[in-house]
Amino acid sequence: LQDPCSNCPAGTFCDNNRNQICSPCPPNSFSSAGGQRTCDICRQCKGVFRTRKECSSTSNAECDCTPGFHCLGAGCSMCEQDCKQGQELTKKGCKDCCFGTFNDQKRGICRPWTNCSLDGKSVLVNGTKERDVVCGPSPADLSPGASSVTPPAPAREPGHSPQ
């Protein structure tokens, strides 16, 4: 025998208390597929969350984060504070990237500058807290007359110009 609940479309639930009729989902609840025996409570985007898409009888609400925060986790399950470029979020708040590291986004951690010498290249542009170094041609490519690129002054590798 076919389950009578299988006839209940999205936006309804199979109400066992009422002879398995397909009752519409009550306000603030939804069912995104047919044959459901309950409707799920709509997600509420409160506090640091804001509503990106309203709930309906057939689909849950979707949240994103208020300005100054960004989403983390599946379906934006958490909001994390933004930092400035050149910073990372620690337990004590936003902190500048340590020397030799950078962050070019408002989220995430500071990452080490690229070590150009590992690829046999030289530093073309020094790194900053906000930007990675730019590696240039290898020193062997810089034989006299072979290139118009002026090699950087010998500095620590990777290089960092004083802020």
């Epitope: 209940c8 479309p9 936006g11 009729i21 519409p24 989902c25 009550p26 306000p27 057939t58």
Partner: antibody, heavy 122, light 109 residues
């Protein structure tokens, strides 16, 4: 403009049939918006006739007194809902309203047509 | 079947009065109740849904309360445009689940 417009009312003899139409404009019936029929006899209160699921399924919700005489149907391509009334009696004389029952308004009737008068008399 | 009983069936009041109308369901309908206002020759207008939520554009002098079987519509300070008939309706969907109350006519004292 968001509105419901009923048509098809008029004078009909006892035992006769009539089909009322309700055309929706400015929105589409969906799982969030169910079309319903309500009637009001002269000088009397509101009486719920029934509703139909607004999406593609043909689930209907009806007042028990309508069974076998009144049938609600829908044509999604025309965004129109119908009330087929058979075996009409003098006591079916009333203004028939089409209403939109909305999930967003706790399934209350948040939009109503102007009504169409049905008179059953010989 | 769900039956909805309203009281009183009619009342006379003056502008500025506080008016209370009650509605009783024959079985529990949680908070699934709507209130409407209807003026002669016009379609009903939704005032309150989910027992206590004010519909869009409805003045704040209207309020609703209750849950289960007993519900109340209150007009805190009656205005000239509020003289009308008021209906409750169960929105507890299902066959015979959306019955209207018997109506309350509010007239000038």
């Amino acid at each position: 403009e968001v509105q419901l417009v009923e048509s098809g009312g008029g004078l009909v003899q006892p035992g006769g049939s009539l089909r009322l139409s309700c055309a929706a404009s400015g929105f589409s019936f969906s799982a969030n918006y169910y079309p319903c029929w309500v009637r009001q006899a002269p000088g009397k209160g509101l009486e719920w006739i029934g509703c139909i699921y607004g999406g593609s399924s043909d689930i209907t919700y009806d007042a028990n007194w309508t069974k076998g005489r009144f049938t609600i149907s829908r044509d999604n391509s025309k965004n129109t809902v119908y009330l087929q009334m058979n075996s009409l009696r003098a006591e079916d004389t009333a203004v028939y309203y089409c209403a939109r029952s909305a999930w967003y308004s706790g399934w209350g009737g948040d939009l109503w047509g102007q009504g169409t008068l049905v008179t059953v008399s010989s | 079947d769900i039956q909805m009983t309203q009281s009183p069936s009619s009342l006379s009041a003056s502008v500025g009065d506080r008016v209370t109308i009650t509605c009783q369901a024959s079985q529990s309908i949680s908070n699934r109740l709507a209130w409407y206002q209807q003026k002669p020759g016009k379609a009903p207008k939704l005032l309150i849904y989910s027992a206590s939520t004010l519909a869009s554009g409805v003045p704040s002098r209207f309020s609703g309360s209750g849950s289960g079987t007993d519900f109340t519509l209150t007009i805190s300070s009656l205005q000239p445009e509020d003289f009308a008939t008021y209906y409750c309706q169960s929105t507890y969907y299902g066959n015979d689940g959306n019955a209207f109350g018997t109506g309350t006519k509010v007239t000038v004292k």
